[in-house]
């Protein structure tokens, strides 16, 4: 019969701006891989079917709902020749290949904030105006897709640093919007970092820090 | 079906305590913010705040802050409007809803409201 | 806190006729990330619940027919209904979903003549 295929384990999604995949171990010897995934209250789709990869993308599918919480296994399938050369899923006696269980994943509550952009600042005597990209997301609404603002509105807020090239304290603000207003000392260059921020999260609330933008740097000026 | 479905009427004294609740069918509770709004008696709507399932994260309209309280249990995945300290002003018709899939898109369900009386 | 003003305070129509409301926030509702207009329209009948007509100002809610039309953009706001029928004859909202707190404006109550 063979020895029985192992079983996946360290399965992890991995996402950001809901571009997901879900990852696993080991790399697989004498057998492949399948996944499935379904809602709560769906059927198991499959995925990735007899795949050698430790990993499969699934953000075709959570994109369709992202506030769905989504489950996931990996299957372990022998080789398994049929008469049509193609492994099969199930034994000769149809029993289901061993298989592991993903953690649950809700896209909305969970996908990580990808580091955001400065996409302008402009000076106005002793006002800055610092606006971030709107970035976009492979979520869909009739065939466009949305921007992270579009999918979680109010839910979303940005918080920046910003300091005095010449020294290191920073002074923070923030925004519902993707603008933020701040007095800055007149005759002052300033640097920037924002961040994406969801502060009713309880996991992954805040993404990476944006590259730093300074005032006064040649491709900078004022809009870039 | 998305459904939301509210406690009874109640007639209460002023000075006591009202819990109503709202239970929601028919999607995923913890990733939805519920909002409560208030409509007087021949009067407009005003919203009171909202409660997000999954962290218990809540807004209040400064008006109801400190006698509503927002809560919600994801085991029966409902929500909860507790409002204390009762007084005439507070006759109404409470309603629940559900915020709309996409980002600041409105409130897309609602209860069928709970009448909340309050009478010496 | 952003205040919303509908105008008018009550209206009266004939069936077919086109009706057209206004609804002015005390501050831009446009996103500038995303360029929406965060603003809200809804229907409420008596002893019913409100039911939602349009999002981001002039998107249709699924099943909303397609007499009712939302337009505006910053400040300035319109629903219209361009054919009236007998079943639209209710106290119609705007709201501001822009920013905490939300705000509703006072209604317009929409009559048959």
């Known amino acids: 019969a063979g020895t029985p295929p192992g079983k996946a384990f360290n399965l992890t999604w991995i996402s950001a701006d809901f571009k997901t995949i879900l990852a696993w171990q080991p790399k697989p010897t004498n057998y492949t891989y399948t996944v499935q995934i379904s809602t709560k209250s769906g059927d198991w789709k499959y995925k990735c079917t007899g795949t050698t990869d430790t990993e499969c993308a699934l953000t075709d599918e959570i994109v369709k709902d992202v506030k769905q919480t989504y489950l996931a296994r990996v299957l372990s399938v022998p080789w398994r020749n049929s008469t049509h050369g193609k492994e099969t899923l199930f034994g000769t006696h149809g029993e289901e290949p061993p298989f592991t269980n993903a953690p649950e994943f809700t896209p909305y509550l969970e996908t990580n904030l990808g580091a955001p952009t400065i996409q302008s600042f402009e000076q106005v005597g002793t006002k800055v105006n610092v606006t971030v990209e709107d970035e976009r997301t492979l979520v869909r609404r009739n065939n466009t897709f949305l921007s992270l603002r579009d999918v979680f509105g109010k839910d979303l807020i940005y918080t920046l640093a910003y300091w005095k090239s010449s020294s290191s304290g920073a002074k923070t603000a923030a925004t519902n919007t993707n603008e933020f207003l701040i007095d800055v000392d007149k005759g002052e260059n300033y640097c920037f970092s924002v961040q994406a921020v969801i502060p009713s999260r309880t996991v992954n609330r805040a993404s990476t820090d944006s590259p730093v933008e300074c005032m006064g740097q040649e491709h900078h000026h004022h809009h870039h | 079906e998305v459904q939301l479905v509210q406690s009874g009427s109640e007639l209460k004294k002023p000075g006591a305590s009202v819990k109503v609740s709202c239970k929601a069918s028919?999607?995923?509770?913890?990733?939805?913010?519920i909002e409560w709004v208030k409509q007087r008696p021949g009067q407009g709507l005003e919203w009171m705040g909202d409660?997000?399932?999954?962290?218990?994260?809540?807004n209040y309209n400064e008006n109801f802050k400190g006698r509503a309280t927002f809560s919600a249990d994801t085991s029966v995945s409902t929500a909860y409007l507790q409002i204390s300290s009762l007084k005439a002003e507070d006759t109404a018709v409470y309603y629940c809803?559900?915020?709309?899939?996409?980002?600041?898109?409105?409130?897309?369900?609602w209860g069928q409201g709970t009448l909340v009386t309050v009478s010496s | 806190d952003i205040q919303m003003t509908q105008s008018p305070s009550s209206l009266s129509a004939s069936v077919g006729d086109r009706v057209t409301i206004t609804c002015q926030s005390s501050?831009?509702?446009?996103?500038?990330?995303?360029?929406?207009?965060?603003l809200t329209w809804y229907q409420q009948k008596p002893g019913k619940a409100p039911k939602l007509l349009i999002y981001?100002?002039?998107t249709r809610e699924s099943g909303v027919p397609s007499r009712f039309s939302g337009s505006g953009s910053g400040t300035d706001f319109t629903l219209t209904i361009s054919s009236l029928q007998p079943e639209d004859f209710a106290t119609y909202y705007c709201?501001?979903?822009?920013?905490?707190?939300?705000?509703f404006g006072q209604g317009t109550k929409l009559e048959i003549k």
């Open positions: 028919g999607y995923t509770f913890i990733t939805y913010w």
């Open positions: 409660i997000l399932p999954y962290s218990g994260s809540t």
């Open positions: 981001w100002a002039s």
């Open positions: 809803a559900r915020s709309g899939y996409y980002g600041n898109s409105g409130f897309a369900y």
């Open positions: 709201q501001n979903d822009y920013t905490y707190p939300l705000t």
């Open positions: 501050q831009s509702l446009l996103s500038s990330g995303n360029q929406k207009n965060y």
